[in-house]
Amino acid sequence: MQQDGLGVGTRNGSGKGRSVHPSWPWCAPRPLRYFGRDARARRAQTAAMALLAGGLSRGLGSHPAAAGRDAVVFVWLLLSTWCTAPARAIQVTVSNPYHVVILFQPVTLPCTYQMTSTPTQPIVIWKYKSFCRDRIADAFSPASVDNQLNAQLAAGNPGYNPYVECQDSVRTVRVVATKQGNAVTLGDYYQGRRITITGNADLTFDQTAWGDSGVYYCSVVSAQDLQGNNEAYAELIVLGRTSGVAELLPGFQAGPIED
């Protein structure tokens, strides 16, 4: 099951079902309010708007310049499930589309599943995939944001996420953890980390780290329930906490924010 490093060259995006939930507008992140008073704040606000203007249709990426600083971790939780599932099916959902914590603080990526039949407990698998493109660099580069974001929205594919949808051959793929019954097994890369699968299928990090930025896929596998949408994903981002972060994230509070 373990797949560390280079992907195998097949596209493995959002599992069964589209990467966008039919209730798309409902999933949009909260609007940003302008609290800045100077040019730097306005630039940060513009970048933040660019980050979120695409809503959940564009992922995020980590900025190399942010390494070594305090950080903010974002999680965009994207639903990759359809409304109804056929009989004898699994429904996997992620909730809480917007989540903020500080680097080294805990974070939980919520994932729940429903099954139509439960003779045996399913296997919960959390996989990590690195981003396809650098989301933060795009956001802070007006030319890139203007040209690419607007072009993408205008292209008529608002649900397509170029930061998430790419071949595994150009990104790192790893198994983070698996759970069957009460037994949780960490992937090789994550051995020694305080990471576990709690509750129904939530992935919990006791401490976030720089390398944690990426897309996390929650999938549930059962021999009985072969249909339905068995996978959903969450995006986890590490941002450098600079003087502009307060303006970038109005209302940001230091410390973990409860679900």
């Epitope: 069964k16 990426g61 190399p64 396809c132 890139s144 594919n157 397509y160 150009v170 790192t172």
Partner: antibody, heavy 118, light 111 residues
């Protein structure tokens, strides 16, 4: 203006090496995966290699695996293709191309000709 | 590997008339996210290829609306509603689902 400009092509003997460069401008180079695609004289297009936006992941066509190495220097906005153990069948125009939504190639360079002949 | 097969390989056209090129893949290019990973390129004589259509049916920026892409799974079609003289060149389909593979190309020339 978004632009890709290849260089480094030329005539080389079989078994020798050559390094191609692709200078990018007009866009945030470090945000995009990049590709090399080649076209033998009078033939069709053949994908050669891809590198992720941060250089951490690379993938090659079977025909060049073990001989070619793709790399990038984001500080210089430049993509490279190191070609070793060149063969006559590597003779082609080599294009660099930018990856775009859908893994399509939305921006192409003008190409640089590589001729492998004794 | 995914094999791409185009037809016809040569297509004489009359300006103002429609034209159609077919592309077939050896396996489905429809991803579970609902998108087909099939692109169309045009390489005009002496030039680099240019992107026309991506994700099966989305026109790239600046591409005239006389070009359209359709199809799903393994069968795809590029249509030019009214051919213009500047449309001559070689058209390639390309799959982007598993690495990247081009079709052999279709040469479009004026009759």
């Amino acid at each position: 203006q978004v632009q890709l400009v290849e260089s480094g092509g030329g005539l080389v003997k079989p078994g020798r090496s050559l390094r191609l460069s692709c200078a990018a401008s007009g866009f945030t180079f470090s945000s995009y995966a990049m590709h090399w695609v080649r076209q033998a004289p009078g033939k069709g297009l053949e994908w050669v290699a891809v590198i992720s936006y941060d250089g951490s992941n690379k993938h090659y066509a079977d025909s060049v695996k073990g001989r070619f190495t793709i790399s990038r220097d984001n500080s210089k906005n430049t993509l490279y293709l190191q070609m070793n153990s060149l063969r006559a069948e590597d003779t082609a125009v080599y294009y660099c191309a930018r990856d775009s939504p859908g893994n399509a190639f939305d921006i192409w360079g003008q190409g640089t000709m590589v001729t492998v002949s004794s | 590997d995914v094999v791409m097969t185009q037809s016809p390989l040569s297509l004489p056209v009359t300006p103002g008339e429609p034209a159609s090129i077919s592309c077939r893949s050896s396996q489905s290019l429809l991803h579970s996210n609902g998108y087909n990973y099939l692109d169309w390129y045009l390489q005009k004589p002496g030039q680099s290829p240019q992107l026309l259509i991506y994700l099966g049916s989305t026109r790239a920026s600046g591409v005239p609306d006389r070009f359209s892409g359709s199809g799903s799974g393994t069968d795809f079609t590029l249509k030019i509603s009214r051919v213009e003289a500047e449309d001559v060149g070689v058209y390639y389909c390309m799959q982007a689902l598993q690495t990247w593979t081009f079709g052999q190309g279709t040469k479009v020339e004026i009759k």
